[in-house]
């Protein structure tokens, strides 16, 4: 038969950061290939990654059409060298993914400190707004465009000469903090969606940036 010795995929897992979304699964294929289908709860199935020997499929193009929808994917297994035949009635083995809601579940990518500027005893720290693959009228949207006030940033800052950290929060991409004159400070930021109740609430910390290096500017 058309599906002899094919095994169903398993461990279907969504990997998603800033809406770049890939479905991964097992096993590595031996004499079989896979096709992925994706659907919203109310929509039709759309096939992607036809007869692939990979164990991942980039579904970003589908989910960015509506990041607030809930998606389901399934992975079909076919014998290697399979050619679609109109006469075949036997359904190949397949496995369903967990449901995936991008807006609630995509991980926040590592943020980047764009710049910092010192004026007297104040420092303005600016976080770079990351671009996503979500579009509006053929224009790519930033993370802030998508999440708006749902997205905040936490700034960790400390004197270069000590380890005691202070924190500040902003619902924009800028911080204005007080510093001691004559002291150098180091900074790291983290993106946070406070409304989330799960492990993907926070990003990893940005790379540390310290005063006295090229990203900074100092004015009296």
């Amino acid at each position: 038969s058309g599906t002899t010795n094919t095994v169903a995929a398993y461990n279907l897992t969504w990997k998603s950061t800033n809406f770049k979304t890939i479905l991964e699964w097992e096993p590595k294929p031996i004499n079989q290939v896979y096709t992925v289908q994706i659907s919203t709860k109310s929509g039709d199935w759309k096939s992607k990654c036809f007869y692939t020997a990979d164990t991942e499929c980039d579904l970003t193009d589908e989910i960015v059409k509506d990041v607030k929808q809930t998606y389901l994917a399934r992975v079909f297994s076919y014998p290697a060298g399979h050619v679609e035949s109109t006469g075949s009635t036997e359904e190949p083995p397949y496995e369903n993914s967990p449901e995936f809601t991008p807006y609630l579940e995509t991980n926040l990518g590592q943020p980047t400190i764009q710049s910092f500027e010192q004026v007297g005893t104040k420092v303005n720290v600016t976080v770079q707004d990351e671009w996503t693959l979500v579009r509006r009228n053929d224009t790519f949207l930033s993370l802030r465009d998508v999440f708006g006030k749902d997205l905040i940033y936490t700034l960790y800052y400390w004197k270069s000469s000590s380890s005691g950290k202070k924190t500040a929060k902003t619902n924009t991409n800028e911080f204005l903090i007080d510093v001691d004159k004559g002291e150098n400070y180091c900074f790291s930021v983290q993106a946070v969606i406070p409304s989330r109740r799960t492990a993907n609430r926070k990003s990893t910390d940005s790379p540390v940036e310290c005063m006295g290096h090229e990203k900074g500017e100092s004015r009296e």
């Epitope: 809930t70 802030r144 998508v146 708006g148 619902n171 991409n173 799960t198």
Partner: antibody, heavy 120, light 113 residues
């Protein structure tokens, strides 16, 4: 078609409790904030608070914090606004609304309103 | 809290003539990350719930006639109606959609002469 359907008008006495509802349909209920807005007779709009049904996260206006509770049951796509002890000054039209698709893009859809009258 | 102040509180306009409503916020509504102003305009027609007209200060909601336009940045915003029609009567509200608590202006009542 996106719809928000609110429960019917209520007449209550001071000190009584009340829960009004807002049922969403035609969209993914868990991913959009439901907003609650008060309009006292002949007055303007006042934002009370909101809830993201997918996580249950809420925000309240300081003017309403502690006096009302916002909740949601995502299994039936319904948000609630409740009072444990009503006052005459709670007499108003209460609207639920749904946030827009993009971040901070306003309240794109509104319920028809629930008129609450509190009188002894 | 951000305070939203609208002027005028009422205006009476002849059909076909333009109308303009000002809204000032006590703090900037400009998001530094994406350079968007999170200012929203609504119209509440008599006996109806409000309806969204403009978000991001100048983006018209789908289905809103192009005679409505929004402009401004930071703390000063304007809603313009290029040619007022009878169906435009009602109360117009601006709203801070930038930061919690979200706040509305007092409203501007538009009447037809």
């Amino acid at each position: 078609e996106v719809q928000l359907v609110q429960s019917g008008a209520e007449v209550k006495k001071p000190g009584e409790s009340l829960r009004i509802s807002c049922k969403g349909s035609g969209y993914t209920f868990i991913t959009y904030w439901i907003e609650w807005v008060r309009q006292m007779p002949g007055k303007g709009l006042e934002w009370m608070g909101d809830i993201l049904p997918g996580s249950g996260s809420t925000n309240y206006s300081p003017s309403f914090q502690g006096h009302v509770t916002i909740s949601a049951d995502k299994s039936i796509s319904t948000a609630y606004l409740q009072w444990s002890s009503l006052k005459a000054s709670d007499t108003a039209m209460y609207y639920c609304a749904r946030s827009g698709y993009y971040g901070n893009s306003g309240f794109a859809y509104w319920g028809q309103g629930t008129l609450v009258t509190v009188s002894s | 809290d951000i305070v939203m102040t609208q002027t005028p509180l009422s205006l009476s306009v002849t059909p076909g003539q333009p109308a303009s409503i000002s809204c000032k916020s006590s703090q900037s509504l400009l998001s530094s990350g994406n350079q968007k102003n999170y200012l929203t305009w609504y119209l509440q027609k008599p006996g109806q719930p409000p309806q969204l007209l403009i978000y991001w200060a100048s983006t018209r909601e789908s289905g809103v006639p192009d005679r409505f336009s929004g402009s401004g940045s930071g703390t000063d915003f304007t809603l313009k109606i290029s040619r007022v029609e009878a169906e435009d009567v009602g109360v117009y509200y601006c709203q801070n959609d930038y930061t919690y608590p979200l706040t509305f202006g007092q409203g501007t009542k538009l009447e037809i002469k």
